[in-house]
Amino acid sequence: APTSSSTKKTQLQLEHLLLDLQMILNGINNYKNPKLTRMLTFKFYMPKKATELKHLQCLEEELKPLEEVLNLAQSKNFHLRPRDLISNINVIVLELKGSETTFMCEYADETATIVEFLNRWITFCQSIISTLT
């Protein structure tokens, strides 16, 4: 059974992930972002279901295309280089989803823009955090 300390750690990691995703979304939506139109042409795959931490596998698998899109953006829109930002997210995701069970991600048939993709995972984090508090 999860202890209060492990629940607290999970909550903190989710809050960190949430902040990173929100920072990316804000950087992309920045009205000074000249590459927004181009960035919105990238296709992202959405999970059919995202209700548990194991479903973060679906986010992990999309981190490479996410980095590719961020490489288009001006670096001043973000505090970190895309590679470092994605690396940080990857570390958190790996810790949160755990490596004990191998979960095969199932994707929806429709693709999403980067904005829709980020909003989906922001909602996911907020939802899990709310169940922990």
Epitope: R38, T41, F42, K43, F44, Y45, P65, E68, V69, D109, E110, T111
Partner: antibody
Framework: EVQLVQSGAEVKKPGESLKISCKGS????????IGWVRQMPGKGLEWMGI????????RYSPSFQGQVTLSADKSISTAYLRWSSLKASDTAMYYC???????????????WGQGTTVTVSS | DIQMTQSPSSLSASVGDRVTITCQAS??????LNWYQQKPGKAPKLLIY???NLETGVPSRFSGSGSETDFTFTISSLQPEDIATYYC?????????FGPGTKVDIK
């Protein structure tokens, strides 16, 4: 090896329909946009349109919109170019090509099929 | 649509010569430009992407430069196997238009 293999040459009469194919291998076919390019005899290259095989999203050049239809079957890693009623002016070599970056079409085309010759004559 | 023009439309040069082709876009395309080589009876081949990046496996005698509306493609030392038609293509805006091509042959 990343490859696009196109269907063989076609000889058709005006008014007939035709569907030519482009099969991808050696890479994740669904993750890259596929473009189609026309080359009329002795002429230059003309960009026709693109399709994303994962969800069959398409973009057409205004010059080809309504003239041709792009489609894809991701289960067999194949993209298609179709005419419902051919004209003599459709006589050309047609190439399919993969967009280099994947996920977005804003990249150049790096891998090309060998081309399919279409001849339309009465 | 963005119009692409190339010059010259054809050229003859000797083996070992430096060959330069220019490509002009009707509006700013940043560095979103490719150069392709098409040999007779063959499919086009990508040589240069993003105006100046050499595609993997392409000989270093090929190079590209330029940004915005004016671009240059150079073969530093022409070889017999370089006989082909060279096309520029923009991918700043749909539709991704090609230049009319430059036919290169040996004197």
């Amino acid at each position: 090896e990343v490859q696009l293999v196109q269907s063989g040459a076609e000889v058709k009469k005006p008014g007939e329909s035709l569907k030519i194919s482009c099969k991808g291998s050696g890479y994740s076919f669904t993750d890259y946009w596929i473009g189609w390019v026309r080359q009329m005899p002795g002429k230059g290259l003309e960009w026709m349109g693109i399709i994303y095989p994962y969800d069959s999203d398409t973009r057409y050049s205004p010059s080809f919109q309504g003239q041709v239809t792009l489609s894809a079957d991701k289960s067999i890693s194949t993209a298609y170019l179709r005419w419902s009623s051919l004209k003599a002016s459709d006589t050309a070599m047609y190439y399919c090509a993969r967009h280099r970056g994947g996920r977005s079409y804003y990249y150049g085309m790096d891998v090309w099929g060998q081309g399919t010759t279409v001849t339309v004559s009465s | 649509d963005i119009q692409m023009t190339q010059s010259p439309s054809s050229l003859s040069a000797s083996v070992g010569d430096r060959v330069t082709i220019t490509c002009q876009a009707s509006q700013d395309i940043s560095n979103y430009l490719n150069w392709y080589q098409q040999k007779p009876g063959k499919a086009p081949k990508l040589l240069i992407y993003d105006a100046s990046n050499l595609e993997t496996g392409v000989p270093s005698r090929f190079s590209g430069s330029g940004s915005e509306t004016d671009f240059t493609f150079t073969i530093s030392s022409l070889q017999p196997e370089d006989i082909a038609t060279y096309y520029c293509q923009q991918y700043e805006n749909l539709p991704f238009t090609f230049g009319p091509g430059t036919k290169v042959d040996i004197k």
